[in-house]
């Protein structure tokens, strides 16, 4: 199964991924790629970690903002656009024979709701609205155009609207 994360255009998207270095400080190479995890490595790599460095960062919008020295390799994509939608692979390259941990996370970027946020609303929508999916793996992101993005259902819209209202945001209808 896959977890789906929702972000609004222009917001930051947060895709969680982590492991526990064993022993502490024994870091494992990690790659993030756009597209479901292939046989080896990542497809369309957006960044890698190697020891204590972040390499192959293909855009300045991709960040590991957590403490990746402690195994938090969650990806933040700043200022997302519809083109950022798709499946992302977080691959933790644990040494050994076919030991890699593969995690596919789906990012859905939606157009902004007609909302005037209150100053107190300071969080990424992706962390507020993770959603479990029971579908199988999805393919490389380049095959998924914005025109084929999944619809966001009414329940999600109502949840989003209510949470924004609860936070003190002004909602225009």
């Amino acid at each position: 199964s896959e977890v789906e994360y929702i972000a609004e255009v222009g917001q930051n998207a947060y895709l969680p991924c982590s492991y526990t270095p064993a022993p502490p400080g024994n870091l494992v190479p990690v790659c993030w790629g756009k597209g479901a995890c292939p046989v080896f490595d990542c497809s369309n790599v957006v960044l890698r970690t190697e020891n204590r460095d972040v390499n192959d960062r293909t855009s300045g919008r991709y960040w590991l903002k957590g403490d990746f020295h402690k195994g938090d390799v969650s990806l933040t994509i700043e200022n997302v656009t519809l083109a950022d939608s798709g499946v992302y692979c977080c691959r933790i390259q644990i040494p050994g024979i076919m030991n890699d941990e593969k995690h596919n996370l789906k990012l859905v970027v939606i157009k902004p709701a007609k909302v005037t946020p209150a100053p107190t609303l300071q969080r990424d929508l992706t962390s507020a609205f993770p959603r479990m999916l029971t579908t199988g793996e999805h393919g490389p992101a380049e095959t998924q155009t914005p025109g084929s993005l999944p619809d966001v259902n009414l329940t999600q819209i109502f949840t989003l609207t209510n949470e924004l209202r609860d936070s003190g945001a002004t909602i225009r209808t």
């Epitope: 292939p38 497809s43 293909t58 390259q93 076919m98 380049e142």
Partner: antibody, heavy 123, light 107 residues
């Protein structure tokens, strides 16, 4: 110029062992995944094993992983395949291949191949 | 394992012909497909990766298309040097698997 040169093939009896080598030149060897692919006489291609950049991660065809071991020595720009308990069905040309790489790509297809070395398992 | 089935197994054609070879995967592999060309006694040569991207130095008469389970390799106008065996390879699921090959012969 990228070059991959395999060696170590030959005639071996069933149950015997061989160690294949692949000498790489013309590129930064430690930047690339490397792979062994084999081709039985008159047959198609079959993936055997792959290894990541620094040798810490290895991948095998399930039916071979108890008998074959892939390794690399980046200081010597060399790839190896240790083959034990050889069987007649292991008879094939064994190719060393480089995983394609460019900035931000993945190494799941192979852009340079050696000329191959023939392994014959027969009594 | 993901099975890759090529058709036809062999094909006779003439210089200048347009030729299409198909490759079908036993399950969805999205765009994770590669095409190789192999001539007798030689190593395979990378032609197309990610279903449709032409490898460096490959003539533009070669093209690839498809996604999901059905893929095609097209040669728009056969040249004498194109007579060879062509293989597809998927790289979505472990293990990597190849099609059985399509032998392209001179008519």
């Amino acid at each position: 110029e990228v070059q991959l040169v395999e060696s170590g093939g030959g005639l071996v009896k069933p149950g015997g062992s061989l160690r294949l080598s692949c000498a790489a030149s013309g590129f930064t060897f430690s930047d690339y995944y490397m792979t062994w692919v084999r081709q039985a006489p008159g047959k198609g291609l079959e993936w055997v094993s792959s290894i990541n950049y620094d040798g810490r991660n290895t991948y095998y065809l399930d039916s071979l992983k108890s008998r074959f071991t892939i390794s690399r020595d980046n200081a010597k720009n060399s790839l190896y395949l240790q083959m034990n308990s050889l069987r007649a069905e292991d008879t094939a040309v064994y190719y060393c291949a480089r995983g394609y790489y460019y900035y931000g790509s993945s190494p799941n297809y192979f852009d340079y191949w050696g000329q191959g070395t023939l392994v014959t398992v027969s009594s | 394992d993901i099975q890759m089935t090529q058709s036809p197994s062999s094909l006779s054609a003439s210089v200048g012909d347009r030729v299409t070879i198909t490759c079908r995967a036993s399950e969805n592999i999205y765009s994770y497909l590669t095409w190789y060309q192999q001539k007798p006694g030689k190593a395979p040569k990378l032609l197309i990766y990610n279903a449709k991207t032409l490898a460096e130095g490959v003539p533009s008469r070669f093209s690839g298309s498809g996604s999901g389970t059905d893929f095609t390799l097209t040669i728009s106008s056969l040249q004498p040097e194109d007579f060879a065996t062509y293989y597809c390879q998927q790289h979505y699921g472990t293990p990597l698997t190849f099609g059985q090959g399509t032998k392209l012969e001179i008519k």
